[in-house]
């Protein structure tokens, strides 16, 4: 007769393993015993587990609640036991041995590979802001056994950089993602992607990217300056800018005080009917964490009655 | 035909020693793992202590752990169990018995006593 | 350490009558159990082991069932040279632990 078992036996954590373990032997031949033992190199053998012919299963007390036999039907030839809910301890050497009558002993060793899936974890790097230089925009971990696999999925151009540490049953991969930030990556995902044989499919942890940026400000309203003429009513300024954050607007004239009966909305200066008083220069101040720009105009409300048109000057700085 | 044949009992005071002998006879005594078991007058069966095959594992009884030590020379077919501080309560009759060899090479379990002596008295009184 | 409990402690029996004694223990032990015979004055004696297997040389009339916790000592037709009182033990865990003990008297 001969044993057969498998070279190595694979479970993810926390799951229950088979240590298959089944006597092919002729006919009328018996198994008395199976007994089941690790025996891991450098360390004495430890007994795991006894089938015997009459008593039955035995569990050692190191194991004790931890191993059954497979459900019926059995085998008398089988010797094979279930080890539940397996740890990253139980990895490691398994020893079944078998006494048969007539034919003797036999015994045939196993690996036991216990995979701990990782719990992967994303980090950001620091705040995000348009004309740095290559800056960390996020680093991925993952420990694992065997060591996972950390992989980035995204349409922004970047770089990336891994290291590995060693632990005693275990590794940590870690992997970071640089980049240049410019504002067209703002709101662009960035997905770290974590293998392992562990896992039935691959993990993903996706980070939105956030780019703080402001850019210039500009004036709309007095593109035809004809417009602006006494008595024209629904006459406004609008302040245009785009930012990350979303930008503040405010409104000043830089000449005196706002004229009574003009409305100031966010990025919009709404104007009462206009009068000679309303001309002046006026300025939008545009402002978020990252910077600030101002606009400045200068509105000239024409009289009708005067022949000549006066000019506008349109004036932007920062 | 087994026989095993104990010896060594008697009187003896409390804190005193004594070394009880079993010897063993029609069988191979070294294949098999042999017990102590006592039993105190009137009550019940109390295992004692028992050794494996070549006397590398032994265990014993809480009752009797750090006082009592079993031990066995294969060569002179002899299970020997030495009595330290000795207590009024270790009194009875002490057995030698040997396991049924029906389990190989698994230290965590014992098997069934299949022949046993004829006792010996142990009398521990002041 | 298992606790091997015994019932009954006594009991009075006449000859030819079946007669069947319990034990249990105190966690599961699959048939790692024996049953002994013990006469006043003698060694006990090995009648089954393995909780149901039969000693060789003991009487047919003797028999075990049981496994995990419940074990069942019978005779089927009590013999004059039955009685006798009669012991489980487990074996299961170190240390082997044996129940109180059940006396079987002449009614």
């Known amino acids: 007769g001969e044993l057969e078992t498998s070279d190595v036996v694979t479970v993810v954590l926390g799951q229950d393993a088979k240590l298959p373990c089944f006597y092919r032997g002729d006919s009328g031949e018996q198994v008395g015993q199976v007994a089941w033992a690790r025996v891991d190199a450098g360390e004495g053998a430890q007994e795991l587990a006894l089938l015997h012919s009459k008593y039955g299963l035995h569990v050692s007390p190191a194991y004790e609640g931890r191993v059954e036999q497979p459900p019926p039907p059995r085998n008398p030839l089988d010797g094979s036991v279930l080890l539940r809910n397996a740890v990253q301890a139980d990895e490691g050497e398994y020893e079944c041995r078998v006494s048969t009558f007539p034919a003797g002993s036999f015994q045939a060793r196993l690996r036991l590979r216990v995979l701990v899936p990782p719990l992967p974890s994303l980090n950001p790097g620091p705040a995000l802001e348009e004309g740095q230089g290559l800056t960390l925009a996020a680093s991925c971990t993952a420990e694992g056994s065997p060591a996972p696999s950390v992989t980035w999925d995204t349409e922004v151009k970047g770089t990336t950089s891994s290291r590995s540490f060693k632990h005693s049953r275990s590794a940590a991969v870690t992997s970071e993602f640089h980049l240049v930030p410019s504002r067209s990556m703002n709101g662009q995902p960035l997905t770290c992607v974590v293998s392992h044989p562990g896992l039935l499919q691959d993990q993903r942890i996706t980070h939105i990217l956030h780019v703080s940026f402001l850019a210039e400000a500009s004036v709309r309203g007095l593109e035809d300056q004809n417009l602006w003429h006494i008595g024209r009513e629904g006459a406004m300024l609008k302040c245009l800018s785009e930012g990350q954050p979303p930008p503040s607007y405010n409104w000043t004239r830089l000449d005196g005080p706002l004229p009574s009966g003009v409305r100031v909305d966010g990025d919009t200066l709404g104007f009462p009917p206009l009068t000679t008083e309303h001309s002046g220069i006026y300025v939008c101040h545009v402002s978020n964490e990252f910077s600030s720009r101002d606009s400045q105009v200068t509105v000239d409300v024409l009289d009708p009655q005067e022949d000549s048109g006066k000019q506008v000057d349109l004036v932007s700085a920062s | 035909e087994v026989q095993l044949v104990e010896s060594g009992g008697g009187l003896v005071q409390p804190g005193g020693s004594l070394r009880l002998s079993c010897a063993a006879s029609?069988?191979?005594?070294?294949?098999?793992?042999m017990s102590w078991v006592r039993q105190a007058p009137g009550k019940g069966l109390e295992w004692v202590s028992g050794?494996?095959?070549?006397?590398?594992?032994?265990h014993y009884a809480d009752s009797v752990k750090g006082r009592f030590t079993i031990s066995r020379d294969n060569s002179k077919n002899t299970l020997y169990l030495q009595m330290n501080s000795l207590r009024a309560e270790d009194t009875a009759v002490y057995y030698c018995?040997?396991?049924?060899?029906?389990?190989?090479?698994?230290?965590?379990?014992?098997?069934?006593?299949?022949?046993w002596g004829q006792g010996t008295l142990v009398t521990v009184s002041s | 350490d298992i606790q091997m409990t015994q019932s009954p402690s006594s009991l009075s029996a006449s000859v030819g009558d079946r007669v069947t004694i319990t034990c249990r223990a105190s966690?599961?032990?699959?048939?790692?159990l024996a049953w002994y015979q013990q006469k006043p004055g003698k060694a006990p004696k090995l009648l089954i082991y393995?909780?149901?297997s039969l000693q060789s040389g003991v009487p047919s009339r003797f028999s075990g069932s049981g496994s995990g916790t419940d074990f069942t000592l019978t005779i089927s037709s009590l013999q004059p040279e039955d009685f006798a009182t009669y012991y489980c033990?487990?074996?299961?865990?170190?240390?082997?632990?044996f129940g109180q003990g059940t006396k079987v008297e002449i009614k």
């Open positions: 029609g069988y191979n005594f070294g294949s098999y793992d």
């Open positions: 018995a040997r396991e049924y060899s029906d389990v190989v090479d698994y230290v965590s379990v014992r098997t069934p006593l299949d022949y």
């Open positions: 033990q487990q074996h299961y865990t170190t240390p082997p632990t």
């Open positions: 966690q599961g032990i699959s048939s790692y």
């Open positions: 393995a909780a149901s």
């Open positions: 050794i494996k095959t070549y006397g590398g594992n032994t």
